[in-house]
């Protein structure tokens, strides 16, 4: 807390301007009117205040708005946003995308902070869902944003918002997240033709079930190995050698380099060796000829 001291004669601030950088902390506290500060917040960011001086200005706003700042003030916080705590931000009601953009701009290049996470959470909850414009904005500032959400939070993403998602936005998503996003993407892109559809759906395929992969194998898509390696192991295992060959097209040769890694390793173990030999890649580890394969999962289902 800054002590209450009288403002020295002639130092009362008539407006928020650069002369205030020469004020000591106690002078700022005594000589700057909180209401004046609130109406001239847009000027603060142009003035090279120190963090200590910003603390004083924040204290004045906190006293003026104990229940939380109005959006007119929030939009112009600038660097003062860096002094806010998540507790402060929880009191806000941010509804304008322009306000969100202004605050994210201040944090541009920064790691995702608890303050920003709280701000985004408040904004999205206020909107009720993660609409396309919001998602566009958030992924522009934080490409990993989507993958920072829980599967439960992702379930509120409408399929229409999926159009805003870029491949790099999904780089850090785990299978549980892709399981939620894939059906939405499938729905969003359903009216596209084969090759265009594959280009759009490719980044989401880590959540695709076996039947969708089988369907893709009939469409000459030429999936690259990087995409194949991100597929769910349980979705890849039931695919036949012929289906994988069709799915990968000319990229099938890349299986050799990945034969010790999942899901390729596990898939090889499930294939007949003579089927693998038809690929001519020297893949080893398949089921030897003459062996009977029992599908235990099918047996369990029947019993």
């Amino acid at each position: 807390e800054v002590e209450k001291t009288a403002c020295p004669s002639g130092k009362k601030a008539r407006e928020i301007d650069e002369s205030l950088i020469f004020y000591k902390k106690w002078e700022l506290e005594a000589c700057v009117d909180a209401a004046l500060l609130a109406t001239q917040m847009d000027r603060v960011n142009a003035i090279p205040f120190t963090y200590e001086q910003l603390d004083v200005l924040k204290h004045k706003l906190d006293e003026l708005y104990p229940q939380g700042y109005p959006e007119s003030v929030i939009q112009h916080l600038g660097y003062l946003f860096l002094k806010m705590s998540p507790e402060d931000i929880r009191k806000w009601n941010v509804t304008s995308l322009e306000t969100l953009k202004a605050l994210l701009e201040v944090n541009k290049g920064h790691e995702m902070s608890p303050q920003v996470a709280t701000l985004i959470d408040r904004f999205v909850k206020g909107r009720g869902q993660l609409d396309k414009d919001t998602l566009d904005t958030l992924t522009a500032f934080y490409p990993g944003y989507l993958c920072s959400l829980s599967p439960e939070e992702l379930s509120s993403v409408p399929p229409s918002s999926i159009w805003a998602v870029r491949p790099q936005d999904l780089d850090t998503c785990d299978p549980r997240q892709l399981d939620v996003l894939y059906p939405k993407a499938r729905l969003a892109f359903q009216n596209m033709n084969g090759s265009e559809y594959f280009v759009k759906i490719q980044s989401f395929l880590g959540g695709a079930p076996t039947e969708d992969l089988k369907a893709l194998s009939q469409q000459n898509v030429s999936m690259d190995l990087a995409t194949f390696m991100k597929l769910r192991t349980d979705a890849v295992l039931p695919l036949t050698v012929a289906e994988v060959q069709k799915l990968l097209g000319p990229h099938v040769e890349g299986l050799k380099a990945e034969e010790r890694h999942r899901p390729v390793r596990d898939w090889i173990l499930r294939q007949r060796q003579d089927d693998l030999d038809t690929l001519g890649l020297g893949l080893q580890g398949g089921i030897p000829n003459g062996y009977l394969v029992l599908d235990l999962s099918m047996q369990e289902a029947l019993s």
Epitope: I21, P48, Y51, Q53, L82
Partner: antibody, heavy 117, light 107 residues
Framework: QVQLVESGGGLVKPGGSLRLSCAAS????????MSWIRQAPGKGLEWFSY????????YYADSVKGRFTISRDNAKNSLYLQMNSLRAEDTAVYYC??????????WGQGTLVTVSS | DIQMTQSPSSVSASVGDRVTITCRAS??????LAWYQQKPGKAPKLLIS???RLQSGVPSRFSGSGSGTDFTLTISSLQPEDFAIYYC?????????FGQGTKVEIK
């Protein structure tokens, strides 16, 4: 009086790791943002990371993003820099500085990091 | 990123001379500018903040001016201890960036 003392520099091979420390005294460390700035031999100054007083707000310049990690322990009045995947171009004197927002008002004496095979 | 360009890159002067160093920002930085002095083998020392605010303990022969994109550091009467490298630095946006430095040498 305000004092910042860096330590942990030395010779490391490309791809190696190093952890720098900065011991602060003479001021309330937990009230201040802190920055790391480096200077390659015979070159200018490059600011590349800062951390807020609580540690919640962090920034990395593109030149170090994904390789360096800034952290602090307010109970120990210490600032840290974990440097991984070091490259020859990371060779420099590394300074910690007290960051007051509009400028850096106090600097440590620096610690030399040499990345060479 | 905001580029900071200092000129000249070096200046030869004598004790008692008036020395002026300029710093230009690639975009408007208002008064978010600081000046530092660095001597060989030493850490930089803050001279001026907010374009013109002299740090306590810094001799009054040092002064700063400017706003927007053009800034000046002036040493009104050069002293023997002033021979050093001087850097400007902007804090308007991230990443903070420094000028390349101006070396003040003995003529």
């Amino acid at each position: 009086q305000v004092q910042l003392v860096e330590s942990g520099g030395g010779l490391v091979k490309p791809g190696g790791s190093l952890r720098l420390s900065c011991a602060a005294s003479g001021f309330t460390f937990s009230d201040h943002y802190m920055s790391w700035i480096r200077q390659a031999p015979g070159k200018g100054l490059e600011w590349f990371s800062y951390i807020s007083s609580s540690g919640g707000i962090i920034y990395y310049a593109d030149s170090v993003k994904g390789r360096f990690t800034i952290s602090r322990d307010n109970a120990k009045n210490s600032l840290y820099l974990q440097m991984n995947s070091l490259r020859a171009e990371d060779t420099a004197v590394y300074y910690c500085a007290r960051d007051v927002g509009s400028h850096f008002d106090y600097w440590g004496q620096g610690t030399l990091v040499t990345v060479s095979s | 990123d905001i580029q900071m360009t200092q000129s000249p890159s070096s200046v030869s002067a004598s004790v008692g001379d008036r020395v002026t160093i300029t710093c230009r920002a690639s975009q408007d930085i208002s008064r978010w500018l600081a000046w530092y002095q660095q001597k060989p083998g030493k850490a930089p020392k803050l001279l001026i903040s907010a374009a013109s605010r002299l740090q306590s303990g810094v001799p009054s022969r040092f002064s700063g001016s400017g706003s927007g994109t053009d800034f000046t550091l002036t040493i009104s009467s050069l002293q023997p201890e002033d021979f050093a490298i001087y850097y400007c630095q902007q804090a308007k946006s991230f990443p903070r960036t420094f000028g390349q430095g101006t070396k003040v040498e003995i003529k």
